[in-house]
């Protein structure tokens, strides 16, 4: 008789999840000399230990503590780039501007980027069929708790001027319910962080509006100002040109507004 299995609303664990995490860990530690001491088998064991045999709606930050310890990594606190709903451009930017870091440029973020995972209560199986959806099932699921934990820590690490890339094509340019809006904004430390600078990325070629005047950006400014952190905002009218100018700042066309 086939064993009854809980059916969740979200997609199941990414196929070949253990192999992917282990391979990513090996690759990352080869590329980043300061992380060469990391034992990737221990990292996988700690990752697995955070969710295997546990109810996937009952995961806590403490479950990830062993993994977080193994993934300790110093990032230059004044070179942090946060993002919301515009991950690809943020990653393209840090690939060019190598001294800046998104969360996914750290070991822990790199391991989990774009992956889904969950287990089942009282069995050592990984659930490849379905995993809890944050809205439809539960918020304390393995993926959401992981990102909440590492995002909080990443924001706490920041100092001086922190940059955030926001998607100007969305109806809510700043969304209070995003990881940036619900976790990172509230964990920036006012004693360390002087300014949050938002880069609002425009989608349309002919879009010349000042999206820094958008009501949701004003809401972000209000939240940040109340936390005793200065706020500034820049429109990035042409993201393609923006990236090109990061690559070649000497280019004569890069002196004009981008």
């Amino acid at each position: 008789v086939p064993r009854w299995r809980q059916q969740w609303s979200g997609p199941g664990t990414t196929k070949r999840f253990p192999e992917t995490v282990l391979a990513r860990c090996v690759k990352y530690t080869e590329i980043h000399p300061e992380m060469r001491h990391v034992d990737c088998q221990s990292v996988w064991d700690a990752f697995k230990g955070a969710f295997i045999s546990k109810h996937p709606c009952n995961i806590t930050e403490e479950d990830y503590q062993p993994l977080m310890k193994l993934g300790t990594q110093t990032v230059p606190c004044n070179k942090i780039l946060l993002w919301s709903r515009i991950k690809d451009l943020a990653h393209q930017f840090t690939q060019v501007q190598r001294d800046m870091f998104t969360l996914e440029d750290t070991l822990l973020g790199y391991l989990a980027d774009d992956l889904t995972w969950c287990g089942e209560f009282n069995t050592s199986k990984i659930n490849y069929q379905s995993c809890p959806d944050w809205r439809k099932d539960c918020s304390n699921n393995p993926v959401s708790v992981f990102w909440k934990t590492v995002s909080r820590r990443f924001a706490e690490a920041a100092c001086d001027v922190v940059h955030v890339m926001l998607n100007g094509s969305r109806s809510k340019i700043f969304d209070k319910n995003s990881t940036f809006g619900s976790v990172e904004v509230h964990n920036l430390q006012p004693e360390k962080v002087q300014t949050l600078e938002a880069w609002v990325i425009h989608g349309g070629r002919e879009d010349s509006r000042d999206l820094c005047q958008d009501p949701t950006i004003k809401e972000l400014e209000s939240i940040i100002s109340k936390r005793n952190i200065q706020f500034s905002c820049k429109n990035i009218y042409r993201p393609d040109k923006f990236l090109q100018c990061v690559k070649n700042p000497e280019d004569s066309s890069c002196t004009s507004e981008i």
Partner: nanobody, 124 residues
Framework: QLQLQESGPGLVKPSETLSLTCTVS??????????WGWIRQPPGKRLEWIGS???????NYNPSLNSRVTISVDTSRNQFSLKVSSVTAADTAVYYC????????????????RGQGTLVTVSS
Amino acid sequence: QLQLQESGPGLVKPSETLSLTCTVSGDSISSSSYYWGWIRQPPGKRLEWIGSIYYSGSTNYNPSLNSRVTISVDTSRNQFSLKVSSVTAADTAVYYCAGGDTYGPVGQWPSDYRGQGTLVTVSS
């Protein structure tokens, strides 16, 4: 609960070396669970990170102070110390020792634990 306490002279003469010690209680200073550092706040200004020291013994200093700063650990006394050479009036500040949990991504500036601070005045 981890506690930190700064100690050292409150008055230092210009061109001399400022020396402060931080005594850690509640856990071993050599535990890999923490990293340690110093920050300061000059009168009327923002906090400024001075430097940090890690479990491995490696150090990281603020580039603007780099050549004048040394941070070291004395495990037998459960203490770490700060030395700033060739001080001027601009080094007058409240100095804090601080600790950070080695837990996921961390900045150079430890901010999970902090001492109460000690005022150091540079004056002849």
